[in-house]
Each structure stands twice: as C-alpha cells, then as structure tokens.
Amino acid sequence: QLQLQESGPGPVKSSETLSLTCTVSGGTIGSSNYYWGWIRQPPGKGLEWIGSIYYSGGTNYNLSLKSRVTISVDPSKNQFSLQLRSVTAADTAVYYCARICSSLTSYENFDLWGRGTLVTVSS
Amino acid sequence: QSALTQPPSVSGAPGQRVTISCTGSSSNIGTGYDVHWYQQLPGTAPKLLICGNSNRPSGVPDRISGSKSGTSASLAITGLQAEDEADYYCQSYDSSLSGYVFGTGTKVTVL
C-alpha cells in the first residue's frame, strides 16, 4: 500500500532555507490521477496548504508563500521536495506531504498523508 | 485568515448527534467546488473522512456524513463516541486564491 514519508534536517535557523523531501513508497509518483502536495500546521493551529506539483513538473503555490516556495519532483527517485526560503519563527510547523486525488470521481482531495515532520525555526 | 470558517469547538454527550458547519464564499464552495472533510486525532496526521461533499472513503462508517448547500457545508457524526474526539477540517478549492483552502478547524469534545 502506498505510503509517504517526509525527511529533512530538523531545526532551521532564521533567514535560512528549509528543505524537505517526501519519499513515496508502494506505488509510483508518475500517475496521471494524482498531484503531490505540501501542507503545514503551526503548533496548536490549523492546516495551511503550501503548494502542489504534478509528476511532469507543473506547480501551483499558495499565493501568500509563492515568493519563497519551490516544489520540485524527481520521478526516478519517487520523491518530491519542498524549499522554503528566508524562514522566520512563523514558519515553525509540522510539515506534511500528501497525495492529491485529481480524477473526475475523486474530487481533488488530500487522500493520503505522510506522518509529518516538525520543523523548528530558531534564531 | 482562512477562506473557510468553522466553529472553534463542538461538544456532545456520548451517543449524541453533532454537526459541524463550514462556511465559505462565492469563490470556493459557492462556485461549485467540492468540499472534503478531514479528521485529525491528537498527535497524528489528518485523515480523509468525507470526499466530494458527501462520499465516504472505504473504512469510514456511515455514522459519519457530509453535505453541501450554497456557500456552506456540514459534517455530522451520529452516536458520538470517545474515539471521535479530534480536530475536524473542511477543505475546498478557491478560485480567487488559485489554490486549496482549509477551514479553521473544529475541536470535537465528548462530554
């Protein structure tokens, strides 16, 4: 069964770049029925969509983060990655990767999630 | 500021029926974009609970239901149980933001 796992360096210093990778196992990232996305959740707060990517490389970003975000995909490694530049304490959050259903019958929802990884931005 | 508004908390006695609202606007739910619901148990990742307004993925019991009308949507839980204590989020697409939006989240407490 398909699983997603986030990985990254842990704490990030203020003004630096946060880099995370999501590895997809038990299936292929190159399916035309799915997008792949990043969502974050600051401690004690709600969910915020960061952006998504298609296996062919097409991206869509949250407008409020667009200037700082890059999402890329490596189908050969079954991975997609997030880079968030110039981070501040407000970027401290649990970061989730997720699969986005895009078929006509599955309605563009986040149907599978990774376990999430806490990224703390320190000064 | 989230594009979808939910009540911060909802509570009910065991066995009771509870409903959570999700209010959007003409640029998201009102445009015809589907609404999806997620359950987030403490310390875990969100799990898809309702997709396409009212459809239950495999493994979700039929005591959970969803609906959409106009610019709002609802999630109902029948026969509230201790294991239903969680945060619930609605989600849709917003044309003015050109992206996915989540609700503010609702904490369900079993009294």
């Epitope: - | 065991p14 009771q16 029926r17 979700v60 969803g66 609906s67 999630l75 109902a76 029948t78």
Partner: antibody, heavy 120, light 108 residues
C-alpha cells in the same frame, strides 16, 4: 430493489441463545449499516443494535451484555445473537437498513420481521 | 434515555378526515425525529424524516411538524386502505434511539 429478510427459529427455550440472520439485497453492507429492532406482542418498537458499514457496532446499553452483532459482507448477511433469553424476549425481530445524511438517521427499509417465542 | 410519548394509543376517524397524531420527547431533540407506519400485517415503512421531510414514495397527504419536544404527524383526507396502521415516532438525537409507544389509527 432494496430488500431485507430475517430468518431464525420460531421457538427458543428460556436461558438459551437466539440467532437470527438478516439477508439483504439491492445494496451493499460495505456502504450501509443495518439495525435490529424488536416488538413484543401488542407493544411498541425497541431499537436493539446497529452494525455500521465499517463493521463497528453500537448497542442499546441495557441489552449490551446479551447482544452481539456481526456480518458477512460477501454473503450480504447480518447476524444477531442474543444470550440468556427470557419470556419477555418474545417478540417480532426486524432488521432495517440505516440511512444517514447530515440531518437524518433513519431506518429507510425494513424486513418483514421474524417472530420468536421464548417458551419451555 | 430520551423518552418518547404518544399520549393517544388509538384513535378513530372517518374517511376524508384530517388526523393529527402527536408525539412528545422528554427533552429537546432538535428536530431529529422520524415517523414510521406499521401496517396490520407488520410491514414497517419510513414516512417522515427530520420532523417534516417526506420520504420518497410517501403520498403528500402526510406531513410532519414540530420543534423542541413537541411533534406531530398530520394525515389529510384519510384513506381507508392505505392509512389503517399504527404510527410510531422515533428520535435520533441521542443513542439509544427510542420510539414512541405508537398510535393505532382505525376507521369509524
């Protein structure tokens, strides 16, 4: 079309167990829950238990220790077992399909019922 | 448990009459109320759900209303064949779901 049919013994001795089967057609047990409701002679309806689409169950608390419900999705059958029967368990036993939306929980289709008499 | 009371256990009416059957809950059930019809042969059918919504295939002569703790089922233009039955209210606000004792409708 949607149909439910109960089958079980007509007569059960006191202190014995009752097993009733509800065989359904026209819908899938993976999508709909099934309730059991009973009606003693000349009396009202009493809700007993429901088995939800995912196999989880909810019981009427006073009867919980005596009731068990299970199902076989592939055979479209739901099973009710009731232990330690007494004469006041004599009743018509119905199974019914659960229909749920955000504003309703109802039993939208019912079987014709099976009559069970507890007597020595 | 929530108690559902149908104070009239039986009532008699003439063909063409308008009949009102009442049901009271022991606490506010927030309109989470259904009505069922049980024919003399034991067949049970859902008539009304969520206080006032007509289930598919049910004649429009049937209607429901109420709020809080007090609810009613109205049958307009009583019809002999179709309407001789016992009518039960049922709450689904809180488990266990409970039924009223029933109101048996007979023709004068």
């Amino acid at each position: 079309q949607v149909q439910l049919k109960e089958s079980g013994p007509d007569l059960v001795a006191p202190s014995q167990s009752l097993s009733i089967t509800c065989t359904v057609s026209g819908f899938s047990l993976t999508s709909y829950g099934v309730h059991w409701v009973r009606q003693p002679p000349g009396k009202g309806l009493e809700w007993l238990v429901v088995i939800w689409s995912d196999g989880s169950t909810t019981n009427n608390s006073p009867l919980k220790s005596r009731l068990s419900i299970s199902k076989d999705n592939s055979k479209s059958q739901v099973f009710l077992k009731m232990n330690s029967l007494q004469t006041d368990d004599t009743a018509m036993y119905y199974c019914a399909r659960h229909w749920g939306t955000t504003v309703v929980d109802a039993m939208d289709y019912w079987g014709q019922g099976t009559s069970v008499t507890v007597s020595s | 448990d929530i108690q559902m009371t149908q104070t009239t256990s039986s009532l008699s009416a003439s063909l063409g009459d308008r009949v009102i059957i009442s049901c009271r809950a022991s606490q506010d059930i927030r309109n989470y109320l259904n009505w069922y019809q049980q024919k003399p042969d034991g067949t049970v059918k859902l008539l009304i759900y969520y206080t006032s919504q007509l289930h598919s295939g049910v004649p429009s002569r049937f209607s429901g209303s109420g709020s809080g703790t007090d609810y009613s089922l109205t049958i307009n233009n009583l019809s002999e064949q179709e309407d001789i039955a016992t009518y039960f209210c049922q709450q689904y606000d809180t488990l266990p779901w409970t039924f009223g004792g029933g109101t048996k409708l007979e023709i004068k």
